[in-house]
């Protein structure tokens, strides 16, 4: 049985429904009844959307329960835990999530322009530093003129000395795109940030 | 830059029904709630409820229930409110206002409702 | 619905004078709690919120203190462009209810 943590750009994005997630996965199908419950720091919820079974390539089956929660359940660190019945198992499994502790710190966020070097190339790189930040859960994307992009990278986020996180996001466009001077927006979104949203702009 | 840009003054009669857009431009619509407020001399302001304009989901405040719908029109980016069967009591001005985690960072400039016969 | 209780409702301050204004809900709102400047013919403008987080470009003189039911908004030195309508709102429960403002007036 494992447990998954809601999508950070879910709980960090008001008009989204961050969900919660229970796998339990090398069900037999002699014995393919699965039932979940779900609590909120040991209260139980029933508003789950808990899936048929599906089976696998090795002739297994896997079931998925998804818990609907608040964003401030999360964001406040309550626990969700998911119990696991079925009769395959000697007794319930229980496996539980919440957000790491710590206090949040928004990050700065600072764009570059592409190197003066890498002028000679057909494409350039826009470069997006995210520094300063924890916990390290975050979403950070692109857009043209206000449009999103989707040729761009993250560094996954690494500590920094200071316990704080730092990332790199690279979006790769032609370079007859950056000289037209379009505008490039950097997008991050992290709770430690007022409505968890800060951008910044280049051109 | 962020604008909630609403319409003009209305003056409606008694018992009509008026629908307010709320224009918005310079974020992703469907990122934020919208939320609609009532400002009157009698009691200052009030909230009315919000939209999700992602979902279409919405949340009202049970005083205004029976007066007020929220909708959206996603691909216009526009937000509209409309307030049914008109009393002098819904004299006020209305705002809409960007509700994100963190309520209210940015406000229309309030469109001024006077129900006169 | 959380009754949100405003004092006082109308004051008047010296320029560089420090000026509190409370708001006290009827029950805990655990510091989901904002404040909001109005001036004349103006909508409300966000300067605080979850109770003591200063808004990006709001000056450092305001600041915002409080927890539970109590909650203040202190401006340390009073400037003439501070002069207006000063709402909370608690954002803790449907529905969000506002406090019902604090004139302040220069004397």
């Known amino acids: 049985v494992f447990i998954f943590p809601p999508k950070t750009k879910d709980v960090l994005t008001i008009t989204l429904t961050p969900k919660v997630t229970c796998v339990v996965v090398d069900i037999s199908q002699n014995d393919p009844e699965v039932r979940f419950s779900w609590f909120i720091d040991d209260v139980e919820v029933h508003t789950a959307q808990t899936h048929a079974p599906e089976k696998q390539s090795n002739s297994t089956l896997r079931s998925v329960s998804e818990l609907p929660i608040v964003h401030r359940d999360w964001l406040n660190g309550k626990t969700f835990k998911c119990k696991v019945n079925s009769g395959a198992f000697p007794a319930p499994i229980e496996k539980s999530i919440s957000k790491p502790e710590g206090t949040p710190r928004g990050p700065q966020v600072y764009t570059m322009a592409p190197p003066k070097e890498e002028m000679t190339q057909s494409q350039v790189s826009i470069t997006c530093m995210v520094k300063g930040f924890y916990p390290p859960d975050i979403y950070t994307e692109w857009k043209m003129n206000g449009q999103p992009q989707e040729n761009y990278k993250n560094t996954p986020p690494t500590m920094d000395t200071d316990g704080s996180y730092f990332l790199y996001s690279k979006l790769n466009v032609k370079k007859e795109t950056w000289q037209q001077g379009n505008t490039f927006t950097c997008s991050v979104l992290h709770e430690g940030l007022h409505n968890h949203h800060t951008e910044k702009s280049l051109s | 830059e962020v604008q909630l840009l609403q319409s003009g003054p209305e003056l409606v009669k008694p018992g009509a029904s008026v629908k307010i857009p709320c224009k918005a431009s310079g974020y992703t619509f469907t990122d934020y709630n919208m939320d609609w407020v009532k400002q009157s001399h009698e009691k200052s302001l009030e909230w009315i409820g919000y939209i999700n304009p992602y979902s279409g989901d919405t949340i009202y405040n049970h005083k205004f229930k029976d007066k007020a719908t929220l909708t959206v029109y996603k691909s216009s980016n526009i937000a509209y409110m409309e307030l049914r069967s008109l009393t002098s009591e819904d004299t006020a001005v209305y705002y809409c206002?960007?509700?994100?985690?963190?309520?209210?960072?940015?406000w229309g400039q309030g469109t001024t409702l006077t129900v006169s016969s | 619905d959380i009754k949100m209780t405003q004092s006082p409702s109308s004051m008047y301050a010296s320029l560089g004078e420090r000026v509190t204004i409370t708001c006290k809900a009827s029950q805990d709102i655990n510091s989901y709690l904002s404040w909001f400047q109005q001036k004349p013919g103006k909508s409300p403008k966000t300067l605080i919120y979850?109770?003591?987080r200063l808004v990006d470009g709001v000056p450092s003189r305001f600041s915002g203190s409080g927890s539970g039911q109590d909650y203040s908004l202190t401006i340390s030195s009073l400037e003439y462009e501070d002069m207006g309508i000063y709402y909370c709102?608690?954002?803790?429960?449907?529905?969000?209810?506002f406090g019902g403002g604090t004139k302040l007036e220069i004397k």
């Open positions: 979850r109770a003591n």
């Open positions: 709102l608690q954002d803790d429960e449907f529905p969000r209810t």
């Open positions: 206002a960007r509700g994100g985690y963190d309520y209210g960072d940015h």
